[in-house]
């Protein structure tokens, strides 16, 4: 149990890094967690005994010993960053703060029917960090129902004051609720010539892009590679913005790369987790510790296990020296990035993996795929589950996908005739059905949530959630798959696979080993031609070979259509229906998951 509880009427003395304003101590803790150096914080709540100018201050702190002296102070609330915790962390904050005006640059003012509409507007505006909405009861008539969209350099308010009849809140981009497009391409030999808001050192354009994604003001970036002609600018990552939200000028320049912030699809990409090693590369920074280590992997583990370590450089041992052990230099800096990057000195560098838990678990790299063949291997599809019914006898009922530590996404039609969740069992980490014995551990189902517009598979809305009775501990053989981003609606997926234990032909039996088949997506227009008697809606997605031969079939229902994009697997479809199995010119029809992301989040994030 890491120290998550807040210490009331307690102030940590000293160790100040910076002061920001947050509407609550809980959010102060989140800001501290995402700050590269913050380990502790002190928040000042509103109180008659406190100077109003200090209300809502969140002082971010660091300490070499990872703790600071505690002093009693009324209205002070202190605590620790979640960096010390092993659980998943999220920056998503759906709270609405009543009678608080969060100050920032008011760059857009418009009428909105409700605070929710104002928040949605903020979420779908590229610049917006937070908003303040004047309610119908606001004293000034001309300001009633006004929605002010705001941004600041830090992404947090510049000040927070009490103001009756207004409400404030944050953009929900980090909750995967934005409709903004995600431009995932990195453009080689391109410089974006807009204004720089910050610059950091990065080993490659991918790390630069991730830094841009979690920097509150960065909308796009330019990275100068190590071959860039001007030596002083090599490995420089320029974080940029513009009024329009897009680069105004693109200049063709060799050895530079540019790209965009992926803030609106950050739930399905690694942002904090820089897991690569950089060979013949030295990261410079403040030294924390020097330890003998047998490999760069061991050095990365040392860095990950020292809470203040942000990055490292490993110098391999010279032959016959120090028992073959090299030196591991653990380092940190004010912004979490190296202060300088040098090449050609023989070092191997990398970053802590401690921040990987600040990314969605679904972005973790999994085992390389086994190409060819139809039988899967263990750990190949760690999100795939087998859903069993125990009535009248135990058998495989449907497939499903782990999308959260208590949630399985599957098809609604699987539950025809299922009277109660009590008869259901979810088995994860299973390759062969024969592994399932009486004593095999399973997850009980607490609740079946079927889409309320579902009638039958062919008419759509064939989607259901299972809430598990206990949480799934993620391992290599059981972990979640990412939901597609709403901003990725136009992505063309080319690496899609359907998996399941279903029939291999129409008259068959459930397979013992999990089967896999690579299947191309088919446009909805093409699919509609093949199913003239049905309405193929935008909430469905089709996949199959024109000549047939590979398809999902009976028993695969509810299972995933998984597509790999930018090294991350996305749950693009849920196996739903089709005419026969693998028939010529009869593609399989799947529930189009991206169209249900809001529904999924509404059901799974309900308090």
């Amino acid at each position: 149990e890491c120290v998550t509880q807040l210490l009331k009427d307690t102030c940590f003395e000293g160790g100040d890094i910076t002061t920001v304003f947050t509407p609550s101590a809980k959010y102060c803790q989140v800001v501290c967690t995402y700050h590269p150096r913050c380990l502790l914080f002190t928040f000042t709540a509103e109180s008659p005994s406190e100077d109003p100018t200090r209300w809502f201050t969140c002082v971010l702190k660091d300490s070499v010993t990872e703790t600071l002296p505690r002093v009693n102070r009324t209205a002070a609330i202190s605590g620790y960053s979640f960096k010390q915790c092993s659980h998943q962390i999220s920056a998503c904050n759906k709270d609405i703060y009543v009678d608080l005006d969060m100050k920032g640059i008011n760059y857009n003012s418009s009428v909105a029917k409700s605070a929710q509409e104002c928040q949605e507007r903020c979420t779908d505006d590229v610049h917006c960090h937070f908003f303040t909405y004047a309610t119908r009861q606001f004293p000034s008539l001309e300001h009633r129902n006004i929605c002010l969209l705001k941004h600041t350099q830090t992404g947090t308010p510049t000040r927070i004051t009490k103001l009756d009849k207004v409400v404030s809140g944050f953009s929900l981009k980090s909750c995967a609720l934005s409709n903004l497009a995600c431009i995932r391409d990195i453009f080689p030999n391109t410089v974006f010539a807009d204004s720089n808001i910050d610059s950091v050192m990065a080993p490659d354009a991918f790390v630069c892009g991730r830094i841009c994604t979690h920097h509150p003001g960065c909308l796009f970036f330019t990275f100068f590679s190590q071959e860039w002609p001007k030596e002083s600018q090599r490995n420089l990552c320029l974080l940029k913005t513009s009024e329009s939200g897009l680069p105004s000028t693109r200049i063709k320049k060799s050895k530079a790369l540019s790209g965009f912030s992926l803030q609106s699809c950050r739930h399905s990409i690694p942002v904090f987790c820089h897991s690569s090693f950089y060979h013949d590369t030295d990261f410079l920074g403040e030294e924390l510790d020097i330890v003998a280590a047998k490999s760069h992997e061991a050095c990365q583990k040392l860095c990950t296990n020292a809470v203040r370590c942000q990055f490292f450089t490993y110098t391999p041992a010279q032959a016959s020296c120090n028992e073959g052990k090299g030196k591991c230099y653990l380092k940190l800096s004010s912004n979490g990035s190296p202060t300088k990057i040098l090449h050609g000195r023989g070092g191997i560098s990398g970053y802590t993996l401690r921040l990987c838990k600040m990314d969605n678990e679904c972005t973790t790299k999994i085992k390389p795929r086994i190409v060819g063949g139809t039988a899967s291997v263990r750990g190949e599809w760690p999100w795939q589950v087998t859903l069993h019914t125990t009535s009248p006898t135990q058998r495989h009922l449907c497939g499903g996908s782990i999308i959260g530590n208590q949630w399985i996404l599957t098809a609604a039609h699987c539950f025809y005739g299922v009277e109660s969740p009590k008869i259901l069992r979810v088995y994860s980490g299973i390759l062969n059905q024969s592994e399932i014995k009486e004593d095999t551990s399973f997850f009980g189902v607490q609740e079946i949530i079927i889409h309320d517009q579902y009638k039958m598979a062919e008419s759509g809305y064939d989607i259901a959630l299972l809430k598990l009775e206990t949480t799934v501990n993620y391992t290599d053989s059981q972990r979640p798959i990412c939901l597609p981003s709403k901003g990725d609606r136009n992505v063309i997926y080319t690496d899609c696979w359907v998996t399941g234990w279903g029939y291999r032909k129409l008259r068959d039996k459930i397979q013992n080993t999990l089967q896999k088949a690579k299947i191309p997506l088919v446009t909805n227009e093409e699919c509609q031609k093949r199913y003239r008697g049905h309405k193929i809606t935008h909430k469905m997605i089709c996949a199959g070979y024109r000549e047939g031969g590979k398809d999902a079939c009976k028993g695969d229902s509810g299972g995933p259509l998984s597509c790999k994009h930018n090294e991350v697997w996305h749950l693009v479809g849920i196996t739903s229906w089709g005419e026969g199995c693998a028939q010529r010119e009869r593609p399989g029809v799947y529930t189009n998951v991206v169209e249900y992301v809001d529904w999924i989040l509404e059901k799974t994030q309900a308090v």
Epitope: E1, L39, T67, S86, A298, V307
Partner: nanobody, 119 residues
């Protein structure tokens, strides 16, 4: 070089107590998260308990919650595990290791100390 040396194991009856110690050297002990892990006969390594470099954040496996207590003394470069209400199923070789779940580095562990709970 990371060096860890466990001690304090032994034979104890069910319901009894033991205190394990782990002396650390070769690295700045106070900076690092630490763990106790165990290996029962014929089984794999299992995380038992972990403690943050701050000394305040701790982790316990469900099977030992309320019975075991982890602590550290940074001045002495030593990690401790107080084991109370011991059960037969606690019989294992106990190792101290660098890191804490989910980042425990099982490669950086000591030689281990045998704990046997038997009536």
């Amino acid at each position: 070089q990371v060096q860890l040396q466990e001690s304090g194991g032994g034979l104890v009856q069910p319901g009894g107590s033991l205190r394990l110690s782990c002396a650390a050297s070769g690295f700045t002990f106070s900076l690092y998260d630490m763990s106790w892990v165990r290996q029962a006969p014929g089984k794999g390594l299992d995380g038992v308990s972990g403690i943050g470099g701050d000394g305040g954040s701790t982790y316990y496996a469900d099977s030992v919650k309320g019975r075991f207590a982890i602590s550290r003394d940074d001045a002495k470069n030593t990690l401790y595990l107080q084991m109370n209400s011991l059960k037969i199923e606690d019989t294992a070789v106990y190792y101290c290791a660098l890191g804490r779940p989910p980042y425990t580095d099982y490669d950086s562990r000591g030689q281990g100390t045998q704990v046997t709970v038997s009536s």
